[in-house]
Every structure is written in C-alpha cells, then in structure tokens.
C-alpha cells in the first residue's frame, strides 16, 4: 500500500482542515488509514483523523481543531496499521480556504432596486470576519449568457443593484462566495442559490 | 467599555509561588484567546503564554515551562497564571492580554518583584 | 527563535513631521506582524496588525507596511501624544517575539 498524490489540506480558519489524498489502488480509507496529527510547540495531544472514501483511490480526512492562530503548524501522519505511509506538515494559516456565506436574500421590495444580503460566515471574534470581500453570481434560468459576476470589495454582506440591469419578467439566481486577500485564500465554494422572479416598471416614456 | 483588570503582583521571594488575576469585562472572556505579556524594568516585552477559548490548547515561553501554569475560568470572565519557583528573572510587569497572534487589549499590568 | 530587530533604536523628531521606523525579521514572517505604542508607566496599545490593517480605533496617520522580512510603520504627522516607545511584534511562528522598542522622542 502506498500513497499516490499526497496529502493537501485547507483550512477554513476556524475549526476545520481537510486534507485529501490518493491511494495507489482502491483502498478502504477508514478501515485501512488514520491520519495523525498534533501542533508543534504547544502542550497538545496527537489526535486522530478516520478517513472517508472519496472515489475509488481517493481518502479525504475532516481534521477538528481548537481555533486556529497564524503560527500554529501541524504535524500529519499517514498510517496503514503500523506502517508510517506519509509524514508532513501543515500551517492552516498558510492554505485558508474561507466558509461560504449562508443566508442569500434577494429583497425586491426596494422601489426598483434589488437589495441582496448574506450573512458572514465568521464570528466577530475571528480574524477572518473584518477581512472578507465577496463576488456575487447571478445568472437567469432561460439564457445561459445572461451570467454575470459583481465583485463586493467593501465589507458589508450586501450588493444592490437596479433592477432595470436584469431582464424583466424573467427567473433569476444568485449566489455568493467570499476570499480574504489577506491571507491569500483561496475562494469559498459558492452559498446555496436563491431564486426570484424580476420585475419592473419600465419608464413612463414622454412624448 | 472592553477592559481588563490585573491583580496578584507583590514582592515574594526566590522559589516561592504567586498567582496573578485578570478580570475582563465589555466582552465575553470564552469568545476569546487569552495570553500573559512580561515586561522586565526599563527592558522589551515578552509572550509568556496563553490559552484558548477551549481551555484545551495552552502555550508558554521556554523561559517559563514546567513553572507557569496559565487557566482561564470563563463563567467568571477570568484568567489566571499560577507561577511556582520564583526566579530573580520573572521580576516584572505581567499584563493579561486579549489575543492569541497579537494582543489586541490588554490590562494595565501587576508589578511581580522577585528578591531576597 | 525569530530575531526581531528595530531601527532606529531612539529617534528625535518634530510635531509635523513624517517619521519611518524600521522593524527586520532573521527569517520570512510573511505579513504576520503587529505594531504597538507604549508611554511611559502604560500598558502597550495595538496599533497595527497583519503588518498593513489598522486596529479599530487607531487613527489613519498610522500605517505599515511590509511583508516577508522588511516591514515599516510610518506616522504622517506628529502629535505631541505620539511621542512613545514603539514595538514589532511577530506572530509568524513560536516563540512570539518582539523587537527591542523604538524610542520616539520630542526634538
């Protein structure tokens, strides 16, 4: 047994890292692997991560942690039984991969402007939450080309836009995912989309 | 308004044991990372330890492992750090500080004398 | 151990002028420093975090700069209530150090 694609893990800052890897033939990741891992420097156990399958040769591990600071490092073991597969060494601050917004709401009772809010997926207290910007996806269900992407690079989880930008009478989604540039994440995955049927008044022409 | 408050500091000698206080208050102390800062007289300062929300993961200068145990007691919004075997070289201001990369409030400091 | 070192390490200046204080890690700390102000008989008060964020509260004529080993912190335009003594710290790696303090002093 022997790894194929070793482990690379992201963290989302928070409480959890995913490390995920390739085996050199269809394994059993929980029976088979634990992946081991304990922070260097400080006073902490070694805690034990019980892999899940993720395709054929593939394993992917949930790693639970109490909080994350920048300097924490992170010892990993790979083990197949007694047999030590992989060892290596993870900074989550390092590879961030930031929770996805929840909440989308697209409020269309504002004259004739869409008002969308999301809610931060961070607590106050934590580093992230004063430093995510956002890109907001919206696509219409009839016309594929209708796809369009609004980055919102100032803090607050919200984007408004006229209404006339869409096309009227027509099914809209939204969606929305976040990045910090300070720690040079990568993207979230995107929120759940939301859906609403657009509709305006066009102008009263005069003649 | 968020604030800090250290008590505990007084003058012990070589060897023997002092515990020092922190009480937070305008914030919720579990919400947060909690450490100890020493600054020697007329020197820099130094992170001494600190602890996480959880209590579980704790972290402390060489200079101080074995003899500094830091504890947090978050129904009382308060932190702690008992120090055993007093040396002639812990003789400084200890301030309690929020945070756990850098400190972001911190108390107004105790005064720990350690001499003979 | 991660060497903090700043400079200068006292430095005289006028109320109005700009002043650039140094601080030079031994190794790569990418942008995981904080800046403080310390007076005299106070506690230190956080100035700048993330070597470029300015900590709530703090006024715009402090800013930082910097990332890997060089980082700056600049104070446009001197008040009498800036005179103090200014740290780095750096939270790349354990042990957390700081610098030696920079002394800011009324020319």
């Known amino acids: 047994m022997k790894v194929l694609q070793e482990p690379t893990c992201v963290s989302d800052y928070m409480s959890i890292s995913t490390c995920e890897w390739k085996m050199n033939g269809p394994t059993n990741c929980s029976t088979e692997l634990r992946l081991l891992y304990q922070l260097v420097f400080l006073l902490s156990e070694a805690h034990t991560c019980i892999p899940e399958n993720n395709g054929g040769a593939g394993c992917v591990c949930h790693l639970l942690m109490d909080d994350v600071v920048s300097a924490d490092n992170y010892t990993l073991d790979l083990w197949a039984g007694q047999q030590l597969l992989w060892k290596g060494s993870f900074k989550p601050s390092e590879h961030v991969k930031p929770r996805a917004p929840g909440n989308l709401t697209v409020h269309t009772n504002v004259s004739d402007t869409l008002l969308l809010t999301w809610s931060n997926p961070y607590p106050p207290d934590n580093y992230l939450y004063n430093h995510l910007t956002y890109a907001v996806n919206i696509w219409s269900e009839n016309d594929p080309a209708d796809f369009r992407i609004y980055n919102v690079t100032y803090l607050e989880p919200s984007l408004r836009i006229a209404a006339s930008t869409l096309k009227s009478g027509i099914s809209y989604r939204a969606r929305v995912r976040a990045w910090a540039q300070c720690y040079n994440t990568t993207w979230s995955e995107w929120s759940p989309s939301t859906k609403w049927h657009n509709s305006y008044r066009e102008p009263f022409e005069q003649h | 308004q968020v604030q800090l408050v250290e008590s505990g500091g007084d003058l012990v000698r070589p060897g023997g044991s002092l515990r020092l206080s922190c009480t937070a208050s305008?914030?919720?102390?579990?919400?947060?990372?909690m450490s100890w800062i020493r600054q020697a007289p007329g020197k820099g300062l130094e992170w001494v330890s600190y602890?996480?929300?959880?209590?579980?993961?704790?972290y402390y200068a060489d200079s101080v492992k074995g003899r500094f145990t830091i504890s947090r007691d978050n129904a009382k919004n308060s932190l702690y750090l008992q120090m055993n075997s007093l040396r002639a070289e812990d003789t400084a201001v200890y301030y309690c500080?929020?945070?756990?990369?850098?400190?972001?409030?911190w108390g107004q400091g105790t005064t720990v004398t350690v001499s003979s | 151990d991660i060497q903090m070192t700043q400079s200068p390490s006292s430095l005289s200046a006028s109320v109005g002028d700009r002043v650039t204080i140094t601080c030079r890690a031994s190794?790569?700390?990418?942008?995981?420093l904080a800046w403080f102000q310390q007076k005299p008989g106070k506690a230190p008060k956080s100035l700048i975090y993330?070597?470029?964020s300015l900590q709530r509260g703090v006024p715009s004529k402090f800013s930082g700069s910097g990332s890997g080993t060089d980082f700056t912190l600049t104070i446009s335009s001197l008040q009498p209530e800036d005179f103090a003594t200014y740290y780095c710290?750096?939270?790349?790696?354990?042990?957390?150090?700081f610098g030696q303090g920079t002394k800011l002093e009324i020319k």
């Open positions: 305008g914030f919720t102390l579990s919400d947060y990372y």
């Open positions: 500080a929020r945070g756990g990369d850098w400190a972001d409030v």
């Open positions: 190794q790569g700390i990418s942008i995981y």
């Open positions: 602890i996480r929300r959880s209590g579980n993961t704790i």
């Open positions: 710290q750096q939270y790349n790696s354990y042990p957390y150090t």
């Open positions: 993330a070597a470029s």
